[in-house]
Amino acid sequence: YPYDVPDYAGMLGSAPLVCRAGCSPEHGFCEQPGECRCLEGWTGPLCTVPVSTSSCLSPRGPSSATTGCLVPGPGPCDGNPCANGGSCSETPRSFECTCPRGFYGLRCEVSGVTCADGPCFNGGLCVGGADPDSAYICHCPPGFQGSNCEKRVDRCSLQPCRNGGLCLDLGHALRCRCRAGFAGPRCEHDLDDCAGRACANGGTCVEGGGAHRCSCALGFGGRDCRERADPCAARPCAHGGRCYAHFSGLVCACAPGYMGARCEFPVHPDGASALPAAPPGLRPGDPQRYL
């Protein structure tokens, strides 16, 4: 069964790992919820700025006068320099971003909302954003996610139960109901048939198909041979013989005219049995102990 979740960067925690909204899917990733880390060669709060050109950016945009900037490249609006849905328009020397409501800055990368506005719901902790020139990040409590901790987490959507286990979100905890042959809090242990399994009361473990079965000693039954069996329940005595439970099995008291451990042999009128004679010391009709 192929599903595998290493306990990495909170993936088995209460919320799925989701990067900050706007983090570039091409050049950004995250290891903590709400952050945006850039792959090599990219920079900026949302990893949308190539490193090779970031040194060329003055407050008014790319400047050919900047030392070391040898990348005239394509037009200034190519590569979508405006973040957060801002629209780019070229100017004689650079570009200009027209930002949507709530965002500003050279590339619309700054959110106008601050921690003072209380943007984090459900007890989320607001970090940064002390003034309008810095963005904020909400660190969500267990059970919530989203850029503002506005969304309750379906923790089972993280698929924490391995080997086909059924995930149950009990509110206070997650529980995995494991398929036969698997165990552990996340169904991570393959019981490997009989390995580590004992059958009680002298029972023998029989392997087969990823599960185990106990072949129980006489007088015992159940999945692990822990239940004392009633040997007479199956009516083992033939031809009207009466069954008596015995510490080592059962005893059949045969009806007249029958003999054998289970009263299975008719006694001929001349006294000879149809099949093997009664064991020494037993007369036809005597109780037969079945061992």
């Epitope: 290493p6 909204a21 983090c23 995250c30 849905g85 959507s157």
Partner: antibody, heavy 120, light 107 residues
Amino acid sequence: QITLKESGPTLVKPTQTLTLTCTFSGFSLSTRGVGVGWIRQPPGKALEWLALIYWNDDKRYSPSLQTRLTITKDTPKNQVVLTMTNMDPVDTATYYCARSNWGNWYFALWGRGTLVTVSS
Amino acid sequence: EIVLTQSPATLSLSPGERATLSCRASQSVSSYLAWYQQKPGQAPRLLIYDAFYRATGIPARFSGSGSGTDFTLTISSLEPEDFAVYYCQHRSNWPITFGQGTRLEIK
């Protein structure tokens, strides 16, 4: 320049196992944060996400198909392999591989796709 | 599993017109929704991510809006090359799912 290319059989018989390989260039699965996924599209139908694997060997599978899917990576060869067991005619589709970054579960860069037909 | 429902299934418009495509989620996905464009015989291309951020190289006529459960992709003035199938996809939690698509065709 980043490229991804899918390869594998074009015709598979029912009950057989499909093995598809995604060979990529321009990035490495040893780079922190990088992953590769598989998406399929039956003829004339919608896209369906199948599986993802990341640089740290974390694997994600579509719940409806996870018992049939296995995704692995060969980092030195720049390859990701998807196997799908017990193929059925309804699995006939174009299979795409695409790059996806950790925590940013979108698909920014795609291969051209390979059509797999399941028929006896 | 979050189900994404796109509407309309088919939209017939002329070049120069404004196109409005809708994607509705069965539960909130915050702003974690993307739009892809797919032309016949080609792989999908990422247009918009996290509801309204344009991907690299995407023209300004494409814009996205919405949050929670209702999202819109708008093409302000249709160009001939914009006629294609458009899909939405969320990244809110597992499993990742796509919408069934909206076909934008020439009227």
